[in-house]
């Protein structure tokens, strides 16, 4: 009998009510592979989520998530808050990064500005809670017998104004 | 009551075509899904290809590339276009169709209703 139930192809069940013979998945239900003794019923996209592709009696439904979320976990098994730029999702809601800290993302966490000093290398555009600092050349590089096209700008050491 | 029949089968030479229909009769019937099956001499009849409830079509490997399922809804008839026959092929088919009871779509239902024809022989000499 193991058989007749290896010949049931996907989008059936080997249907142990009728002698094992393939069966069509019942409505809102699929098999994606062959040889299966049920079918499962489909994913439903509702409240936060909604149909990226429709089931089928061959495949589960896919849910991405709606305008504001964003997917986590595999096949988008949920879905978060999304914040703005420079802020992160907490407990509590959306706060704003701290200083020091950046998120140029909707999702995620803060995380600290380059320390630009640690490659040798000098601030050349400050860091915001949606930005990171931009490295420049090297203290040394800008020493005044140094060559360079343009002047070059002031060395300034990581940070911004606090808002 | 539910009623099918089907009709078109015969004797024909190995290569040959043959398409085969199934007439579903009765007041009220609404089927989510339709299918052919066929039980050759001595053997447990088999799964040959079905339309499934959201229109897929679906055939078993021995027959994929040479049998075409179809329907006119108008007629209430499904179809089977068998091509390139062979002797393999010669057994009794069957049109079953599929009905679920009650419409709860939210839960898998196994409660299923199936209505089957008489069949019609279709003998594939070499």
């Known amino acids: 009998l193991q058989d007749l139930c290896s010949n049931c192809p996907a989008g059936t069940f080997c249907d142990n009510n009728r002698s094992q013979i393939c069966s069509p998945c019942p409505p809102n239900s699929f098999s994606s592979a062959g040889g299966q003794r049920t079918c499962d019923i489909c994913r439903q996209c509702k409240g936060v989520f909604k149909t990226r592709k429709e089931c089928s009696s061959t495949s589960n439904a896919e849910c991405d998530c709606i305008s504001g979320y964003h997917c986590l976990g595999a096949e988008c098994s949920m879905c978060e808050q999304d914040c703005k730029q420079g802020q992160e999702l907490t407990k509590k809601g959306c706060k704003d990064c701290c200083f020091g800290t950046f998120n140029d993302q909707k999702r995620g966490i803060c995380r600290p500005w380059t320390n630009c000093s640690l490659d040798g290398k000098s601030v050349l555009v400050n860091g915001t809670k949606e930005r990171d600092v931009v490295c420049g050349p090297s203290p040394a590089d800008l020493s005044p017998g140094a060559s360079s096209a343009t002047p070059p700008a002031p060395a300034r050491e990581p940070g911004h104004s606090p808002q | 009551e539910v009623q099918l029949v089907e009709s078109g089968g015969g004797l024909v030479q190995a290569g040959a075509s043959l398409t085969l229909s199934c007439v579903i009769s009765g007041r009220t019937f609404s089927s989510y899904a339709m299918g052919w099956y066929r039980q050759a001499p001595g053997k447990e009849r088999a799964f040959v290809g079905t339309i499934t409830w959201n229109n897929d079509i679906i055939y078993s490997d021995s027959v994929k590339g040479r049998f075409t399922i179809s329907t006119d809804d108008g007629k209430n008839t499904m179809y089977l276009q068998m091509n390139n026959l062979k002797p393999e092929d010669t057994a009794v088919y069957y049109c079953?169709?599929?009905?679920?009871?009650?419409?709860?779509?939210?839960?898998?239902?196994?409660?299923?209703?199936?209505?089957w024809g008489k069949g019609t022989l279709v003998t594939v000499s070499s």
């Open positions: 079953a169709a599929y009905s679920v009871p009650y419409g709860d779509f939210c839960t898998l239902n196994y409660d299923l209703m199936d209505y």
